[in-house]
Interface confidence: low
């Protein structure tokens, strides 16, 4: 099979959605494309492969099979743990023992009522790993004006890169700093009159894979005088921090 990489590094092959053995003069169900399957490996603990079940013209329990191309794991496997949306299959969850990051993962979606209506995708799982958010954030004072932020990840540190954001209660926007594989960050000039807020997120890139997606943001951690009564930005920040993905 000749393969062409898509921009995110994934091969993406599907059954052609117009070809049926009967001439199709109307745009019938058999000519419809199947929804795209999106897979993400969460911290290499489990993988969710999901699709938009509402794109089907009528409620359809699509089935999913998978295998690994050109490997010892090339036996076709049925999904054993479906995810549902309004009682219709909308995904499949695979457990850790079924995940082989560095083999080509082949996933096939099929309409059981129209077996010819199937779509196959090939995915590079090492480009689809999303780590858990950094946790156990701690701040310590290194000197009168210097703060150090530390955190942990539930994954191999060398596989992750990290992004720190911080702001004071007087800032309109976050200041962002990439810290590579380090899991600490130093802020050299802290203003004792201001309230600081920090958060961190991580990405599986670039040593072990090339995932473009970041983890969720960590919980916020704060430092300094609390001046939120005088400044509305801190309230907005607290209320909306979960939307910064």
């Amino acid at each position: 099979l000749n393969t062409i990489l898509t921009p995110n590094g994934n091969e993406d092959t599907t059954a052609d959605f117009f070809l049926t053995s009967m001439p199709t003069d109307s745009f019938s169900v058999s000519t419809l494309p199947l929804p795209e399957v999106q897979c993400f490996v969460f911290n290499v603990e489990y993988m969710n492969c999901t699709w938009n079940s509402s794109s089907e013209p009528q409620p359809t329990n699509l089935t999913l099979h998978y295998w690994y191309k050109n490997s010892d794991n090339d036996k076709v496997q049925k999904c054993s743990h479906y995810l549902f949306a309004e009682e219709i299959t909308s995904g499949c969850q695979l457990q850790k023992k079924e995940i082989h990051l560095y083999q080509t993962f082949v996933v096939q979606l099929q309409d059981p009522r129209e077996p010819r209506r199937q779509a196959t995708q090939m995915l590079k799982l090492q480009n689809l790993v999303i780590p858990w958010a950094p946790e156990n954030l701690t701040l310590r004072k290194l000197s009168e004006s210097q703060l150090e932020l530390n955190w942990n990840n539930r994954f191999l540190n060398h596989c992750l890169e990290h992004l720190v954001q911080y702001r004071t209660d007087w800032d309109h926007t976050w200041t962002e700093q990439s810290v590579g594989h380090s899991h600490s960050f130093s802020l050299p000039s802290v203003d004792g009159q201001k309230h600081y807020t920090f958060r961190v997120r991580s990405r599986f890139n670039p040593l072990c894979g090339s995932t473009q997606h970041w983890s969720e943001w960590s919980h916020l951690i704060h430092w300094g005088s609390n001046t939120s009564k005088e400044n509305p930005f801190l309230f907005a920040l607290e209320a909306h921090h979960h939307h910064h993905h």
Epitope: L1, I4, D12, D16, L19, P33, P35, E36, R116
Partner: antibody, heavy 120, light 112 residues
Framework: QVQLVQSGAEVLKPGASVKVSCKAS????????MHWVKQARGQRLEWIGG????????TYNQKFKGKATLTTDTSTSTAYMELRNLRSDDTAVYYC?????????????WGQGTLVTVSS | DIVMTQSPLSLPVTPGEQASISCRSS???????????LEWYLQKPGQSPQLLIY???NRFSGVPDRFSGSGSGTDFTLKISRVEAEDVGVYFC?????????FGSGTKLEIK
Amino acid sequence: QVQLVQSGAEVLKPGASVKVSCKASGYTFTEYTMHWVKQARGQRLEWIGGIDPNTGGVTYNQKFKGKATLTTDTSTSTAYMELRNLRSDDTAVYYCARRRRYYGYALDYWGQGTLVTVSS
Amino acid sequence: DIVMTQSPLSLPVTPGEQASISCRSSQSIVHSNGNTYLEWYLQKPGQSPQLLIYKVSNRFSGVPDRFSGSGSGTDFTLKISRVEAEDVGVYFCSQSTHVPFMFGSGTKLEIK
């Protein structure tokens, strides 16, 4: 690398039939559908239809039903298009094109084209 | 059948300038799954057509980033940010949301 090599030019008389071939290499033939496109001089490209070599399923442009018949031979990785009852307005270059099985659904590799000339 | 209308028919461009080609479909080519299957092809003189853009804005493998596609619903545009001599040829838009697939009439890009 992917290659689609078509049969040579044909000169035919009105009423005749012709079978154009398209030999595929560089990929697994049964995993992609094959489509045919007509390009008459000064006219826009016209999609004739497509065939799934895996199942033999065919979808035609209504305009070419009865004119074109699409088949494949998986043992030789070759697609065929037969044109029947040729008329002068069938004079054109005919292309085979592989349809990528991405969610982009596009004709990603094309043959070099076969010129069919119908003349009395 | 859906009609794909392209403009202009001819486009003379100075090397290094931007070129813009418009394509309009006679009805929406948004599929019920939310995707829009609109492609752009380039046919260089004496050659077969080649795929440039699929699904409105996705560049095909090996296509230079000076080519970009945009649009939605029924109106689509192909832009070439800095035209080079090798870009000459006829550009076709095509829809593959509905059967039959339909192509635009083509836009001939020429170097001034």
